[in-house]
């Protein structure tokens, strides 16, 4: 695989180094219409323009090139729309599920400014998906249809290729703790998680079952306290069964011992209750007490990220 640009390289050198472009069988197809400009079947209300990637677009501000093209490849026509949509992906970037996630997402949200749009290569998309989709699914979010990798060009056509392969050598090793079991240690972090969850419950856990790659947490009948009910119906709370997506084969230290109470957060997806975070209830933990007490007065973000959880791997 190509060794491509570092974040410090100049924009054009960066792009030329990262592009694949040998003519192949694809050329006899006029590369399947990828090089159409404006995009075939789509007439933008504004002609393409180039502008600096602003500092308040943190997803892409540090991607390694300075100028982006609008409309972008996701058909966002204003910078405001790009910022709003891109912000949802920041937590995923923080998870460092794949080192090329930023390159991939920014090739779509803030494409490099050239005279025609350059798409990510299929293999770049697949690499990012392989690393990040399981994490998103753990929080009940499918990989979006818009990002289905078969829609992107083959690597031997003009496209942005895999840069780093997996994690850069400088990255800390990512532990295999279940995503739902990574913990926030500050009240702010806890409250952000609560904001992002449909429901928050203080409960006891009767037992844990393994079911088709998931862990199923079965709540004890008594001593349940709904801190945020959200979409939970009476029948949901009577017998609380929480699904920990892909949680059967990863460690979750706080669930090693089921004595005592737990603070659990989750989302309701297609009738199923998905666990998004779990903490041992600790009366002495000031951050937790503060977060629970002031969760409803906390100014939640205006947007909800695609998925929730700790901002950094532990």
């Amino acid at each position: 695989m190509w060794v491509a640009w570092s974040a410090r390289t100049a924009a054009l050198a960066l792009l030329l180094g990262a592009l694949h472009g040998a003519p192949t069988r694809g050329q006899e197809y006029d590369y399947y219409g990828w090089q159409a400009e404006p995009l075939h079947g789509r007439s933008y209300s504004k002609p393409p323009q180039c502008l600096d990637i602003p500092a308040d677009l943190p997803l892409c501000h540090t991607v390694g090139y300075k100028r982006m093209r609008l409309p972008n490849l996701l058909e966002h026509e204003s910078l405001a729309e790009v910022k709003q949509q891109a912000s949802s992906w920041l937590p995923l970037l923080a998870k460092r599920c794949h080192s090329d996630t930023q390159v991939f997402l920014c090739s779509l949200f803030a494409p490099v400014c050239l005279d025609r749009p350059i798409y990510p290569c299929r293999s770049l998309c697949e690499a990012a998906r392989a690393g990040c989709a399981p994490l998103m699914e753990a929080y009940g979010f499918p990989w979006p249809e818009m990002l289905h990798c078969h829609k992107f060009p083959l690597d031997n056509d003009l496209c942005i290729a895999v840069q780093f392969g997996h994690l850069p050598a400088t990255a800390p090793p990512v532990t295999k703790i279940c995503a739902q079991c990574e913990m926030e240690h500050s009240a702010d972090g806890l409250m952000e998680q609560m904001c992002s969850s449909d429901f928050v419950v203080k409960m006891r856990i009767k037992e844990i079952k393994i079911d088709n790659g998931d862990r199923k947490l079965i709540g004890a009948q008594k001593k349940k306290k709904l801190l945020k009910a959200g979409p939970l119906k009476r029948k949901d709370t009577k017998k609380l069964v929480l699904h920990m997506k892909n949680g059967a084969s990863c460690p979750c230290p706080q669930l090693d011992n089921l004595t005592g109470s737990f603070l659990v957060m989750g989302r309701k997806v297609e009738g199923q209750l998905l666990l998004t975070a779990v903490y041992r209830w600790d009366k002495k933990n000031k951050e937790m007490k503060f977060a629970v007490k002031f969760m409803f007065s906390y100014p939640c973000s205006l947007y909800y990220p695609f998925f929730y959880g700790a901002a950094e791997p532990h």
Epitope: R25, G33, H40, A127, R129, A130, D157
Partner: antibody, heavy 117, light 111 residues
Framework: QVQLTQSGAELVRPGASVKLSCKAS????????INWVKQRPGQGLEWIAR????????YYNEKFKGKATLTAEKSSSTAYMQLSSLTSEDSAVYFC??????????WGQGTSVTVSS | NVVLTQSPASLAVSLGQRATISCRAS??????????MYWYQQKPGQPPKLLIY???NLESGVPARFSGSGSRTDFTLTIDPVEADDAASYYC?????????FGGGTKLEIK
């Protein structure tokens, strides 16, 4: 030139499993998706799933989750589909098809699976 | 799921005339400025053969008598003029969304 060669016809008992193979040649195996498509006698086409051998990522039609399992072996450029808990409804011809730049443009010859006691 | 409705289910056309097959999607199959719609021909005992990709592009080696048109939800396969060898079943297929889906098929008979 690109070729997909599928394994031979199978006659299997109800409740059993079967593993179909699709050997690819003439291109870099990790570049193209391998799709599996079902066709019951005298019926139309039904997409089962696809696998990207480069990453191992799989994408299933919800209808076939639990029924079909896709794998790919890079060393032999071969894709596999395992069908489990077979019933008469699974009697069909199964095609593998490579999705290259932007279409399923290469197809295997098909494998006939008959489920009968 | 995106449902593809093909019409007619069967069609008889005289040699040298035009055959038109329609495919309607239950929702748009367009993204990235392209229509992810395909047309295949299948003869008994054979695998399907790609004719048209991305709604209107002719697959290499396919006669120019075949053409595809349409966008979003309405698509058409046209064969003009029809030849004896075109007797077969024709399927539309979308892959804009998972699961990928096929139309029910149109059986073309040459009179």
């Amino acid at each position: 030139q690109v070729q997909l060669t599928q394994s031979g016809a199978e006659l299997v008992r109800p409740g059993a499993s079967v593993k179909l193979s699709c050997k690819a040649s003439g291109y870099t195996f990790t570049d193209y998706y391998i799709n599996w498509v079902k066709q019951r006698p005298g019926q139309g086409l039904e997409w089962i799933a696809r696998i990207y051998p480069g990453s191992g990522n799989t994408y299933y039609n919800e209808k076939f989750k639990g029924k079909a399992t896709l794998t790919a072996e890079k060393s032999s450029s071969t894709a596999y589909m395992q069908l489990s808990s077979l019933t008469s409804e699974d009697s069909a011809v199964y095609f593998c098809a490579a999705y290259s730049a932007s279409a399923m443009d290469y197809w295997g010859q098909g494998t006939s699976v008959t489920v009968s006691s | 799921n995106v449902v593809l409705t093909q019409s007619p289910a069967s069609l008889a056309v005289s040699l040298g005339q035009r055959a038109t097959i329609s495919c309607r999607a239950s929702e748009s199959v367009d993204s990235y400025g392209k229509s992810f719609m395909y047309w295949y021909q299948q003869k008994p005992g054979q695998p399907p053969k790609l004719l048209i990709y991305l709604a209107n592009n002719l697959e290499s080696g396919v006669p120019a008598r075949f053409s595809g048109s349409g966008s979003r939800t309405d698509f058409t396969l046209t064969i003009d003029p029809v030849e004896a060898d075109d007797a077969a079943s024709y399927y539309c297929q979308q892959n804009n969304e998972d699961p990928w889906t096929f139309g029910g098929g149109t059986k073309l008979e040459i009179k």
